[in-house]
């Protein structure tokens, strides 16, 4: 699997928060590629040695996934081709809080961006009219 030398691509993330016990989204977008098979998405978490999630050649590759994320992650596979690398995190835990890296490899090159993910027991504010 080769990548284009030292070329870099633009990867963009947005800090977000997740409600404990619910599903959360870690947002990441990138310059899309023409072929899905040329796109690799890797999600990493600071302080965690295994991968959070990996998607390559059009499907999940979870052989190197860290145990703490087993069965709890997914990308939006049908949106990867248009540059959406966002990660769905199921059943958010307090320990999921931290710094994440969204790392992208395409035929154009590679790029990454970090995001801060907060977790807690958040509630929608009540609006009294």
């Amino acid at each position: 699997f080769g990548i284009s030398g030292r070329h870099s691509i633009t990867v963009t993330t947005v800090a977000s928060a997740g409600n404990i016990g619910e599903d959360g989204i870690l947002s990441c977008t990138f310059e899309p590629d023409i072929k899905l098979s040329d796109i690799v998405i890797q999600w990493l978490k600071e302080g965690v040695l295994g991968l959070v999630h990996e998607f390559k050649e059009g499907k999940d590759e979870l052989s190197e996934q860290d145990e703490m994320f087993r069965g709890r992650t997914a990308v939006f596979a049908d949106q990867v081709i248009v540059g959406n690398a966002s990660l769905r995190l199921k059943n958010v835990q307090l320990t999921d809080a931290g710094t994440y890296k969204c790392y992208i490899i395409t035929s154009k090159g590679k790029g990454n961006a970090n995001l801060e993910y907060k977790t807690g027991a958040f509630s929608m504010p009540e609006v009294n009219v």
């Epitope: 699997f1 302080g47 965690v48 295994g50 190197e64 860290d66 145990e67 790392y103």
Partner: antibody, heavy 121, light 107 residues
């Protein structure tokens, strides 16, 4: 100055135990994953074990799984390797090393001087 | 586990020579590859990380290239202090495997 200092090596009989220590200084210990790597006499480098910054995740080479235990004491800035059921093939210089990068994807940028473990009857 | 194969296992070269060492992974490791230098009786020293990035304090005559499964360490002009053993190591898989080493000797 960033430094790692191993201790605890020595001569032990087959089936015996040893605990290696690695004292860290000059950096924030709990933000870096740490490794143990060994080198048998006249041989190459062999990765042994790793532990995440928090200590929550641990990994082992197949050759030591079930016999060795890696741990860390953040209050003492110290990394440990508990070695049980030692075999002759565990004879080596043992190095502790710090993993470069916040996400574990880079190499080992700081190494200790090594401590020698000899397993022999 | 991912196997890392280095070649050659040893080579003889003279001061000023350009030296190239190759490392091949049994499956893709993307750019998650490091190179180390080790001298007898000493701990390894990190030279290159992320396949191409020079570690702090390492002379610019060292360079790394490659991605996927094939990687190269190049010493553009060999210096007396460069005679040592060099190792590649992957960190994509949580088995952190090393190559078998390449010993660079004086011709």
């Amino acid at each position: 100055e960033v430094q790692l200092l191993e201790s605890g090596g020595g001569l032990v009989q087959p089936g015996g135990s040893l605990r290696l220590s690695c004292a860290a200084s000059g950096f924030t210990f709990n933000t870096h994953a740490m490794h143990w790597v060994r080198q048998a006499p006249g041989k190459g480098l062999e990765w042994v074990s790793a532990i995440s910054g928090s200590g929550g995740s641990t990994y082992y080479a197949d050759s030591v799984k079930g016999r060795f235990t890696i741990s860390r004491d953040i209050s003492k800035n110290t990394l440990y390797l508990q070695m049980n059921s030692l075999r002759a093939e565990d004879t080596a210089v043992y190095y502790c090393a710090r993993l470069l990068g916040r996400f574990g994807e880079y190499g080992m940028d700081v190494w200790g001087q090594g401590t020698t473990v000899t397993v022999s009857s | 586990d991912i196997q890392m194969t280095q070649s050659p296992s040893s080579l003889s070269a003279s001061v000023g020579d350009r030296v190239t060492i190759t490392c091949r992974a049994s499956q893709t490791v993307y750019t998650w590859l490091a190179w180390y230098q080790q001298k007898p009786g000493k701990a390894p020293k990190l030279l290159i990380y992320d396949a191409t990035n020079l570690a702090t304090g390492v002379p610019s005559r060292f360079s790394g290239s490659g991605s996927g499964t094939d990687f190269t360490l190049t010493i553009s002009s060999l210096q007396p202090e460069d005679f040592a053993t060099y190792y590649c190591q992957q960190s994509y898989s949580t088995s952190w495997t090393f190559g078998g080493g390449t010993k660079v000797e004086i011709k």
